[in-house]
């Protein structure tokens, strides 16, 4: 019995279905086929869980969190024992193993391993201003998304003529900050933060209105 090499790892957007491949060759009939799919979750590597089981011509549910979401892609028994996971969740990220036994065929590699990573687009980021908006001050524009896998990068742009930030601005795309030094009337306007990762983008806005000093009445 020989389980074929798997692609190594699969990436899927949260909520989308994933297919985890596992095929094998055997010299025996599929009368005594026994397939166990296990997962070692990334979030809890010490706690492997059963995903689905095929034994004695019947299918059995694995861990409760997979109930109703997991099944074999084809009619069993078969030499293709790939499974699907519907409505993928962040907690589905992990290393999946298919363990195949088909007596009396013994020996050979009877385990296939596939990694699954569930990707999450950035959630709507939160934009805020830190510092005084008085003319001549320094301000920091902050942007962060609560969710996003892989971790989002943050790009600030001024929704003005060209999308470019003022020359006095410096940004950190990892932290999601922009520092604008010595703000002037020209710094006023609408700023957009774009949080993006491999599977999506999300935006928030800040309306920066620089406050000019009030002329003093001399009298």
């Amino acid at each position: 019995l020989e389980v074929s090499e798997s692609p190594g790892s699969i990436q899927v957007a949260r909520g989308q279905p994933a297919v985890l491949p596992c095929t094998f060759t055997t010299s025996a009939a599929l009368i005594n086929l026994n397939v166990i799919w296990m997962v070692t979750p990334l979030s809890n590597a010490n706690q492997p869980e059963q995903v689905i089981l095929y034994q004695g011509g019947q299918m059995f549910d694995g861990a409760p969190r997979f109930h109703g979401r997991v099944g074999f892609t084809g009619t069993m028994p078969a030499t293709n024992v790939s499974i699907f996971i519907n409505n993928t969740q962040l907690s589905d990220t992990g290393t999946y193993q298919c363990l195949v036994n088909n007596l009396p065929d013994i020996g050979g590699r009877n385990i296939g391993v596939t990694g699954l990573t569930v990707l999450v687009p950035p959630s709507a980021p939160h934009c805020q201003i830190q510092g005084s908006q008085d003319i001549g001050s320094d301000v920091i524009l902050l942007c962060s998304s609560e969710e996003g896998i892989p971790r989002p990068t943050y790009l600030w742009e001024k929704l003005d003529n060209t999308l470019k930030l003022p020359p006095t601005a410096t940004q950190d795309q990892v932290q999601g900050t922009v520092t604008i030094r010595n703000i002037s009337a020209l710094s006023s306007g609408l700023y957009q933060c774009v949080a993006s990762n491999a599977i999506g983008t999300s935006t928030c806005l800040l309306d920066l209105q620089v406050i000019s000093p009030q002329p003093r009445n001399i009298g």
């Epitope: 790009l155 001024k158 929704l159 060209t162 999308l163 470019k164 774009v194 935006t203």
Partner: antibody
Framework: DVQLQESGPGLVKPSQSLSLTCTVT?????????WNWIRQFPGNKLEWMGY???????IYNPSLKSRISITRDTSKNHFFLQLNSVTTEDTATYYC??????????WGQGTLVTVSA | DIQMTQSPASLSASVGETVTITCRAS??????LAWYQQKQGKSPQLLVY???TLAEGVPSRFSGSGSGTQFSLKINSLQPEDFGSYYC?????????FGGGTKLEIK
């Protein structure tokens, strides 16, 4: 001066994909600005569809997010619209346009796309 | 999404008259509003952005005003080339949305 020109098939069958190209001359699409697709329905209603920015990310109208893709070819100074699973409701004149602050200072002349069996 | 409501949907005026078109936003958009003119069979042309800034090459008889949720476009001393359709559009982030348009016809 910057010029934009739309091109693509004028007739698409329902359930198929609509693909259009915007050719930009007189300005590099990687220098500045956002490069947009806007459509105008037969009743004259205008709808912004999305843009690809000079830096390469794309933002889409949430009403189209599951069907739309905007990409670019920087070597040819082109950007593209793909709209999947079209219906007769997608019949419109499609414009490409350049924006900075989300107002559209330069537009192509538009191309009529009819969705019909 | 922010809804933009234009009025009137159509109006007739004579050359030399002054007309005003109004636009209402469903929420506060500060001064982030643009106006466009569109002639039959042509693409829209930017007239005004940031509520009152005239786009390059736009005659001074056009003027925009307003902030918050209420805006207007005024055309003084109408010229024959001013007849067509006019649209407002908010540019307060994405998605930008347009008004339904105002058709300006010759009386």
């Amino acid at each position: 001066d910057v010029q934009l020109q739309e091109s693509g098939p004028g007739l698409v069958k329902p359930s198929q994909s609509l693909s259009l190209t915007c050719t930009v001359t007189g300005y590099s699409i990687t220098s500045d600005y956002a490069w947009n697709w806007i459509r105008q329905f037969p009743g004259n209603k205008l709808e912004w569809m999305g843009y690809i920015s000079y830096s390469g990310y794309a933002i889409y109208n949430p009403s189209l997010k599951s069907r739309i893709s905007i990409t670019r070819d920087t070597s040819k100074n082109h950007f593209f619209l793909q709209l999947n699973s079209v219906t007769t409701e997608d019949t419109a004149t499609y414009y490409c346009a350049r924006s900075g602050g989300s107002w559209f200072a330069y537009w192509g002349q538009g191309t009529l796309v009819t969705v019909s069996a | 999404d922010i809804q933009m409501t234009q009025s009137p949907a159509s109006l007739s005026a004579s050359v030399g008259e002054t007309v005003t078109i109004t636009c209402r936003a469903s929420e506060n958009i500060n001064s982030y509003l643009a106006w466009y003119q569109q002639k039959q069979g042509k693409s829209p042309q930017l007239l005004v952005y940031n509520a009152k800034t005239l786009a390059e090459g736009v005659p001074s008889r056009f003027s925009g005003s307003g902030s918050g949720t209420q805006f207007s476009l005024k055309i003084n001393s109408l010229q024959p080339e001013d007849f067509g359709s006019y649209y407002c559009q908010h540019h307060y982030g994405t998605p930008p949305t347009f008004g339904g348009g105002t058709k300006l016809e010759i009386k």
